[in-house]
């Protein structure tokens, strides 16, 4: 018995389309093997019509395709513009046509329903507009024009030229009679309902001389478009409802178990709290189309979504809709990364952002989600170096660790930084992800002076205290610019007095600028990392002024005689519960040796090899 399964019988009518789904056990071999749709001939051979390898027979050219969905063990054969000749016996299968992994399908294409001669068929989606054309002869030009709906053996008047409108069509129907010379009147019905479906009769005049024309109106509920997206990834619903509703409020809703539709987001400012921080409704175009982006997809986001237009911003019968069925694939290509990153006021966070590894050259961005109205996400930083002004000196986007992940570092945190941020690229939009930054109680682990004033031509030494738990990490100093943070040589100076409870493992790493030049003015970061994975950072601003008094200047750590413009830091240490930074599994084992060459406009700093780092405590 074949493990492939599908419909044993499919019936449709001429001119229509079918979408035949075949199911197979989603083993690794089955997922990747050839899928086919073939027609059984009199000889018993099965001639391939379409396959997953791109083959399409001449008979099917331009009207058929085969799509494989390996994650749920399905492939779908779509065939359009059916004719009676398509009736026959087929197989959908895996591998080679003559082997046993297949399922027999019988396709029957019939002529379609018997309609009165000369009946015009109108096929329109629910909520849309139909224009029924009704021709008449010259002698009936002055006579009454009318449209009837046939219900069983009776005809019910819908509208006529004497201003009668059937209550079921109130405010959504009009009869238009053109100027002289045009022998046709039209009936326009807006906001079509499923109940409008049926046979209509146009009539002009009365008695035996009247003109009649039959119209078959087929009102279709839009068939949902199947959308398959990866867990943790992103989906975009593009909604084009037509110009008629360009100025009407728009919405996206999700169908619930009661078959009603709960608003997910609308243009009136409503948003489902389950999508907080991970949804945007993009402003509509002139044609009234809009799109909704949802990131950080969860399994529970699966379901049927409808977009529509109505002044209430929610689903109402007879208004245009578009439908999707969203599936969230748990076998995701998008790697797990923390959805919540915690930092302390004054401290920092390092956020790991996934991107499609095939798109290493794509531009990387980080934006701040704002929930007001339809939501927006203004860019804060991008890989080419643009940084929003108010983030100068405290935000950097690094290409490391690479191979599908980039890093964003934000320091000098305040409670205002709490919120949702999106990682995105100018490439594959499905890889947009969301991270929430939470500001928790605690003290920063790295301690640097407050803003420092350096004297031109002299030596400046800036200390950075780190606790024992960072002893096995690589320490670095870098000079911040809006294109990144350029690593500088630094010096490990042994034990620090700032962490009295950490014994000899509490250390100091210093940056020496000698001699200080004008180019040295700016932001400097002290940080820790392991391999290409970044941990905490602390920032200090160095201002450069003209020489007043001779002598070298040393910014002393936590001493009573500190210069007045230097802030003395609290010595309390608290571990930040930040998985993106602290999880040791995220760190590579190898150490990167800091470049000790000339940096920062000629200022020279050397690493004192005699004070190289000892193996301290563990990284936790």
């Amino acid at each position: 018995k074949s493990p492939v399964f599908g419909p044993q019988e499919v019936s449709s009518v001429e001119g229509n389309s079918v979408s035949i789904k075949c199911y197979y056990p989603p083993t690794s071999v089955n997922r990747h093997t050839r899928k086919y749709w073939c027609r059984k001939g009199a000889s018993g051979r099965c001639i391939t019509l379409v396959s997953s390898e791109g083959y399409v027979s001449s008979n099917y050219a331009g009207r058929a395709n085969l799509t494989n969905f390996p994650e749920n063990g399905t492939f779908v054969v779509n065939i359009a513009q059916l004719s009676r000749d398509d009736s026959g016996h087929y197989k959908c299968g895996l591998g080679i046509n003559s082997r046993g992994l297949s399922f027999d399908v019988s396709l029957e294409v019939s002529q379609g329903p018997e309609l009165p001669n000369g009946t015009e068929v109108y096929t329109v989606d629910v909520g849309r507009t139909v224009t029924i054309k009704c021709p008449f002869k010259t002698e009936n030009a002055p006579k009454t024009k009318a449209l009837y709906k046939k219900i069983g053996q009776t005809s019910v008047l819908v509208i006529d030229s004497r201003n009668y409108v059937n209550p079921n069509y109130k405010d959504r129907i009009r009869l238009r009679i053109p100027g002289t010379g045009q022998l046709i009147f039209t009936v326009v019905i807006d906001r079509l309902r499923l109940s409008d479906h049926g046979l209509y009769l146009c009539q002009a005049g009365d008695g035996s001389n009247r003109d009649e024309k039959n119209a078959d109106l087929q009102v279709l509920e839009p068939e949902p478009e199947l959308v398959y997206e990866d867990l943790r990834g992103s989906v975009t619903f593009h909604c084009a409802l037509g110009l008629e509703v360009a100025n009407v409020a728009k919405f996206l809703c999700r169908v619930n178990s009661r078959e009603t539709c709960d608003v997910v987001i609308n243009t009136l400012g409503k948003r489902d709290s389950a999508f907080e921080g991970r949804i945007l409704l993009n402003p509509q175009d002139k044609d009234g189309s809009f799109s909704v982006v949802i990131t950080g997809l969860r399994k529970e986001d699966e379901g049927r979504y409808l977009c529509g237009a109505h002044s209430d911003g929610q689903l109402q019968e007879g208004w245009p809709i578009q439908a999707w069925q969203l599936f969230v694939n748990e076998e995701s290509t998008i790697p797990r990364s923390p959805t919540v990153v915690k930092g302390v006021a004054g401290g920092s966070v390092a956020v790991l952002c996934p991107y499609n590894p095939k798109e290493s050259q794509s531009l990387k961005y980080w934006c701040l989600w704002e929930g007001a109205q339809n939501g927006r996400c203004p860019l804060l930083v991008e890989s080419q170096g643009l940084v929003q002004e108010q983030y100068e000196g405290r935000l950097s986007l690094l290409q490391e660790p690479g191979n599908g992940t980039f890093t964003v570092i934000l320091n000098q945190l305040t409670t205002q930084d709490a919120g949702f941020y999106w990682c995105l690229t100018n490439g594959d939009t499905r890889w947009r992800t969301t991270v929430e930054i939470k500001i928790i109680e605690g003290e920063p682990n790295l301690k640097v002076p407050g803003n420092v004033t350096a004297v031109l031509g002299e030596t400046l030494n800036i200390p950075c205290h780190f606790p024992c738990k960072f002893s096995s990490y690589e320490k670095y100093w870098c000079k911040w610019s809006n294109t990144g943070c350029q690593t500088l040589p630094s010096q490990d100076e042994g034990p620090s007095e700032a962490f009295v409870n950490c014994d000899e493992n509490s250390r100091l790493v210093s940056l020496t600028l000698n001699p200080v030049t004008r180019a040295d003015e700016g932001w400097y970061w002290c940080g820790v990392k392991q391999g290409h994975f970044y941990g905490e950072t602390a920032a200090v601003y160095v201002a450069v002024e003209e020489k007043k008094v001779a002598g070298s200047r040393y910014v002393s750590p936590a001493k009573a005689d500190a210069a007045p413009d230097e802030k003395v830091l609290d010595s309390g240490v608290r571990e930040i519960e930040n998985k993106a930074i602290q999880d040791p599994r995220l760190f590579a084992e190898e150490k990167v040796v800091a470049d000790t060459g000339d940096q920062a406009g000629g200022s020279r700093a050397s690493v004192d090899s005699s004070s190289s780092e000892e193996q301290g405590g563990s990284s936790k």
């Epitope: 499919v10 009518v13 229509n16 079918v18 068939e223």
Partner: nanobody, 127 residues
Framework: EVQLVESGGGLVQTGESLRLSCAAS????????MAWFRQVPGKEREFVAA??????????YSADSVKGRFTISRTSPKGETYLQMNGLKPEDTAVYYC??????????????????WGQGTQVTVSS
Amino acid sequence: EVQLVESGGGLVQTGESLRLSCAASGRAFSDLRMAWFRQVPGKEREFVAAVEWRGSSRYYYSADSVKGRFTISRTSPKGETYLQMNGLKPEDTAVYYCAAVSPVVGDPRNSDTYNYWGQGTQVTVSS
């Protein structure tokens, strides 16, 4: 809310026929799958047959165990669903359930894909 009510079950002899009906009330979508499952006490629900209406095309599925004997049919996307059971055997004895899902998603044989279920009707085939 969609309600499903089955009828037509009963006691028959081997080789005889029965016709089960499933009436759906409440909102029904034009893209809809209706199915019949059966269950014997102590065993899992077993797929019997399904019919899908998508647009104006119909798709009929059935389990190997009933192929050629049972036929599922539906008069229209909004009409009743029937299961015509011919050549009944004692092993067909079970409670037969009508199920529905809209829109049409997932494998029709998988009971988890259906979001509406009837109360069931008993079919007993005696030898």
